[in-house]
Amino acid sequence: MAERAALEELVKLQGERVRGLKQQKASAELIEEEVAKLLKLKAQLGPDESKQKFVLKTPKGTRDYSPRQMAVREKVFDVIIRCFKRHGAEVIDTPVFELKETLMGKYGEDSKLIYDLKDQGGELLSLRYDLTVPFARYLAMNKLTNIKRYHIAKVYRRDNPAMTRGRYREFYQCDFDIAGNFDPMIPDAECLKIMCEILSSLQIGDFLVKVNDRRILDGMFAICGVSDSKFRTICSSVDKLDKVSWEEVKNEMVGEKGLAPEVADRIGDYVQQHGGVSLVEQLLQDPKLSQNKQALEGLGDLKLLFEYLTLFGIDDKISFDLSLARGLDYYTGVIYEAVLLQTPAQAGEEPLGVGSVAAGGRYDGLVGMFDPKGRKVPCVGLSIGVERIFSIVEQRLEALEEKIRTTETQVLVASAQKKLLEERLKLVSELWDAGIKAELLYKKNPKLLNQLQYCEEAGIPLVAIIGEQELKDGVIKLRSVTSREEVDVRREDLVEEIKRRTGQPLCIC
């Protein structure tokens, strides 16, 4: 069976390879050879065996979330949502699929990663690739010029994911965006403040937020001698500088993208620089860069941004990095990306390589792409890479062997003797009606030891024990699972006592 599964995977991989070679217009001989290999692999699967036992698995790049993982996820979401709300954001939702036309031409080289849906009767549809383009469509469609919103939802990318590093084909994004005409850099600074607040609250390790500006990049490319048509493709090369050496980036720009070596060297002098506000000031004095209108605007805005970031108390977390060239076509101004400096791995362990954990920027032209009159709505926003954060938190908890509660049950209604099911059902109902999170075991006569064991395993802190004598006395025995201490509580005081012990507010308002 394992051999068959391996062969099936090889057939799939070889099929992808053949398709890739055809797309790249590889030599006819190479394609012919790889097709012949594919046919030989298929022949080894056998004629009718393809109708063999269906392998139960989730599709490539997706995963199920176990209760434990969901508990982690909800904690992470809670931190993020509380921060978004603290900053006054409203919440919206949009369809998981959009008209294909809506997404086309918005993502540059990444467009190939969009999932197209099979024709469903006329409309050409695609799964959303991010939450930003649907947000811009929402603004244009509803003629909104001013909103501060957050949106947490799944997005889809036909990536080849390295799932061990927290990358998937279906994953959550948590976006916060401010749309509207405001004074320069105030909303941008708030977005960076939010990013820092969230990453600090999540306690996933030290981080750095790299900041740059699309106008500085474009201005720099212009003065270095890059033609307009090559800006975007050179951007995507420069953006790899956090992963590979300058030599490799230069080779790609010269060898694959046809840039002259001297132009690449001029770019290299700039993009290898990073620092703080002093670098902004240094570049404002740069004889060539300061002569470029776009770059000058960008540098001026960054200087202002650093002033606000200092007032927000986060300037120590920010680095002006000229190699940051985020790969999305729609950015027009400030761009930023948060990276973990090192994850809290145990001493001697390899730090987790999860890369960027949050990113964003200004995209003043995107809404205008959807408006018939091209009316622009300036926007700035950020996206938290929660899947990567889930991976880090999960691995950290595993390393610490920390037990995570997957339910919020406060009390188990138990009985010490037989024939007390009716009494347990009455009591658990009273507790539910009073807003207490309660459970009981679905057995007529459960053993007390089994009930206590269930509490231990599920992390339930309290047990309300009913017995013949307690019923006569009008009391319930309330037992703490950890300390094993028991007290008799009058039935009418039980709700209040449970709330007191579990720190729940006394009224469910």
Partner: antibody, heavy 120, light 107 residues
Framework: QVQLVESGGGLVKPGGSLRLSCAAS????????MSWIRQAPGKGLEWVSY????????KYTDKVRGRFTISRDNAKNSLYLQMNSLRAEDTAVYYC?????????????WGQGTLVTVSS | DIQMTQSPSSVSASVGDRVTITCRAS??????LAWFQQKPGKAPKLLIF???NLESGVPSRFSGSGSGTDFTLTISSLQPEDFATYYC?????????FGQGTKLEIK
């Protein structure tokens, strides 16, 4: 069981020639792509050349192209590597290896290797 | 040519330890990666193919993961016979290249 046995290695002077052979048994030789992989003393592995099941496709690394020729005789269940204009840097243990699932460039069966020493 | 970089180049560990070796490709290779074990004076032995498939007869303490450019070989609980040199190899495009090797030594 699958068996690959190389022969033909030895000491040769720079510029000289050698012909390596590999005798295969325990599987249907004519169904499989085959390859030569070498390992210089104390060094890592290097894929030298491969040949398809029917000899239609052959490839060589840049280092040996034009000097080495891979061939096979399916009737004799044998694989060969003709090495000409040998250089000191060709000194290595040469392994004959079979492709995984007939066509996948991952060696799932290897010979014991034959040592080629190029020295004056 | 696709460059394969293994890390660490050598690692010392004890019987029962969990060991992880990583392999990085200079460009994306999908899942076209294999792991081999080689003992002194012997031919390499295939352990894992297409990133995560265990070759038949290989103990289940060996596992592989990864896709694209980053791959991992994990030995969950080292046995005395596991001390050897481990190589990764890309099978994405010719010339098929190996990593420089990781020597696993007894601590």
């Amino acid at each position: 069981q699958v068996q690959l046995v190389e022969s033909g290695g030895g000491l040769v002077k720079p510029g000289g020639s050698l012909r390596l052979s590999c005798a295969a048994s325990g599987f249907t030789f004519s169904d499989y792509y085959m390859s030569w992989i070498r390992q210089a003393p104390g060094k890592g592995l290097e894929w030298v050349s491969y040949i398809s099941d029917s000899s239609r496709y052959t490839k060589y690394t840049d280092k040996v192209r034009g000097r080495f020729t891979i061939s096979r005789d399916n009737a004799k269940n044998s694989l060969y590597l003709q090495m000409n204009s040998l250089r000191a840097e060709d000194t290595a243990v040469y392994y004959c290896a079979r492709y995984l699932y007939q066509v996948i460039a991952i060696a799932d069966a290897w010979g014991q290797g034959t040592l080629v020493t190029v020295s004056s | 040519d696709i460059q394969m970089t293994q890390s660490p180049s050598s690692v010392s560990a004890s019987v029962g330890d969990r060991v992880t070796i990583t392999c990085r490709a200079s460009q994306g290779i999908s899942s076209w990666l294999a792991w081999f074990q080689q003992k002194p004076g012997k031919a390499p032995k295939l352990l894992i193919f297409v990133a995560s498939n265990l070759e038949s007869g290989v103990p289940s303490r060996f596992s592989g993961s990864g896709s694209g450019t980053d791959f991992t070989l994990t030995i969950s609980s080292l046995q005395p016979e596991d001390f050897a040199t481990y190589y990764c190899q890309q099978a994405e495009s010719f010339p098929y290249t190996f990593g420089q090797g990781t020597k696993l030594e007894i601590k």
